[in-house]
């Protein structure tokens, strides 16, 4: 399987909410001995590999923001801890996997990574990740709503988030 990032860049005004999204592509094994671990973290475009460094999002580590379940089950993070920080990550039955950040500030700007681990309990872990940039802007040049930029080069027109 692979992870797709529908949008590679999110440009948002201060105070807005944004939902960063990743999507699982390809066949997903739903067997008893396969589970999925999904999480989010901040990173940098490191020398070794993008997303290899794991930094907290608003003081919450990737351990705090994880989802761990089987197949295409829906899941949510621990509500109280994440929501106290204006965060919520969720996963649906269709392979979509997101983190919502509320009341954005300039400090939220940076590179965000989603990590998906397919765990085959008697064999190995298979890791894939996706990366996207969040730019939070203030002042007269800031958009009125979040503007998202598709990852695929063939579809380069802007899409304004509802």
């Amino acid at each position: 399987f692979k992870v797709a990032t529908p949008y590679s860049l999110y440009v948002c005004p201060e105070g807005q909410n944004v939902t960063l999204t990743c999507r699982l592509l390809g066949p997903v094994d739903k067997g008893h001995d396969v589970t999925f671990y999904k999480t989010w973290y901040r990173s940098s475009r490191g020398e070794v590999q993008t997303c290899s460094e794991r930094r907290p999002i608003r003081n919450l580590t990737f351990q705090d923001l994880h989802l761990h379940h089987g197949g295409h089950q829906a899941a949510n993070t621990s509500h109280d801890l994440a929501q106290r920080h204006g965060l919520e990550s969720a996963s649906d039955h269709h392979g979509n996997f997101s983190i919502t950040m509320r009341n954005l500030t300039l400090l939220d700007s940076g590179l965000y990574c989603c990590l998906v681990v397919e765990i085959r309990h008697h064999h190995s872990e298979h890791r894939v990740h996706g990366a996207m940039e969040l730019q939070v802007q203030t002042g007269k040049d800031a958009p009125s709503n979040c503007v998202v930029y598709p990852s695929s080069s063939q579809d380069s027109e802007n899409i304004t988030a509802a």
């Epitope: 001995d33 589970t35 671990y37 990737f62 681990v117 765990i119 064999h123 190995s124 872990e125």
Partner: antibody
Framework: QVQLQESGPGLVKPSETLSLTCTVS????????WSWIRQPPGKGLEWIGY???????NYNPSLKSRVTISVDTSKSQFSLKLSSVTAADTAVYYC???????????WGQGTMVIVSS | EIVLTQSPATLSLSPGERATLSCRAS??????LAWYQQKPGQAPRLLIY???NRATGIPARFSGSGSGTDFTLTISSLEPEDFAVYYC?????????FGGGTKVEIK
């Protein structure tokens, strides 16, 4: 802050079954993997196996025929049973939280189990 | 299973010196390698994950490097509390395995 605490008898007779329990406090057991790791006196670390709260298990092939790991989410506990023990099973037994694509990030303090008649 | 070989078995150094510990895997583990520190009578403590990322609260004097089969843990300037046994551990496949350990002792 998540903490782990092992409990169980410190002395087991040869050919009997070693039984240990790990209690998870300060956090939910309903996520991650929960592992058992052992360390014979003066030697290195050996991973025994883990359980996911869903019940999925994974054991070290070298011990698989003798090991059972189970979980009781209502008590926030997971347990190890090792059958037909010999003196070679004498070790400090640790329980640990195992996060996928990460590491064993939280460990119990360990409990010494001696196999002797 | 993947065998991890650590060297040297014992490293005798003085406080303030640089310690370089090696871990070699019998086959590639990509960068899926962790390092732990264990002091007598205590459980291991996670230092490094994914070959070079420091775990939360670990001082900057600890650094990891390497990928594939050869890895290094470096302690830039040994503090008295750093004298301990260090283990590497792979998690590219199961069974999860540890190296035999390197003891860093006071010279």
């Amino acid at each position: 802050q998540v903490q782990l605490q092992e409990s169980g008898p410190g002395l087991v007779k040869p050919s009997e079954t070693l039984s240990l329990t790990c209690t998870v406090s300060g956090g939910s057991i309903s996520s991650y993997h929960w592992s058992w790791i052992r360390q014979p006196p003066g030697k290195g670390l050996e991973w025994i196996g883990y359980i996911h709260y869903s019940g999925s298990t994974n054991y070290n092939p070298s011990l698989k025929s003798r090991v059972t790991i189970s979980v009781d989410t209502s008590k926030s506990q997971f347990s190890l049973k090792l059958s037909s023990v010999t003196a070679a099973d004498t070790a400090v037994y640790y329980c640990a939280r195992d996060i996928p694509a990460f590491a064993f990030d939280i460990w119990g303090q360990g409990t010494m189990v001696i196999v002797s008649s | 299973e993947i065998v991890l070989t650590q060297s040297p078995a014992t490293l005798s150094l003085s406080p303030g010196e640089r310690a370089t510990l090696s871990c070699r895997a019998s086959q590639s583990v990509s960068y899926y390698l962790a390092w732990y520190q264990q002091k007598p009578g205590q459980a291991p403590r996670l230092l490094i994950y994914d070959a070079f990322n420091r775990a939360t609260g670990i001082p900057a004097r600890f650094s990891g490097s390497g990928s594939g089969t050869d890895f290094t843990l470096t302690i830039s300037s040994l503090e008295p509390e750093d004298f301990a046994v260090y283990y590497c551990q792979q998690r590219i496949n199961w069974p999860l395995t540890f190296g035999g350990g390197t003891k860093v002792e006071i010279k």
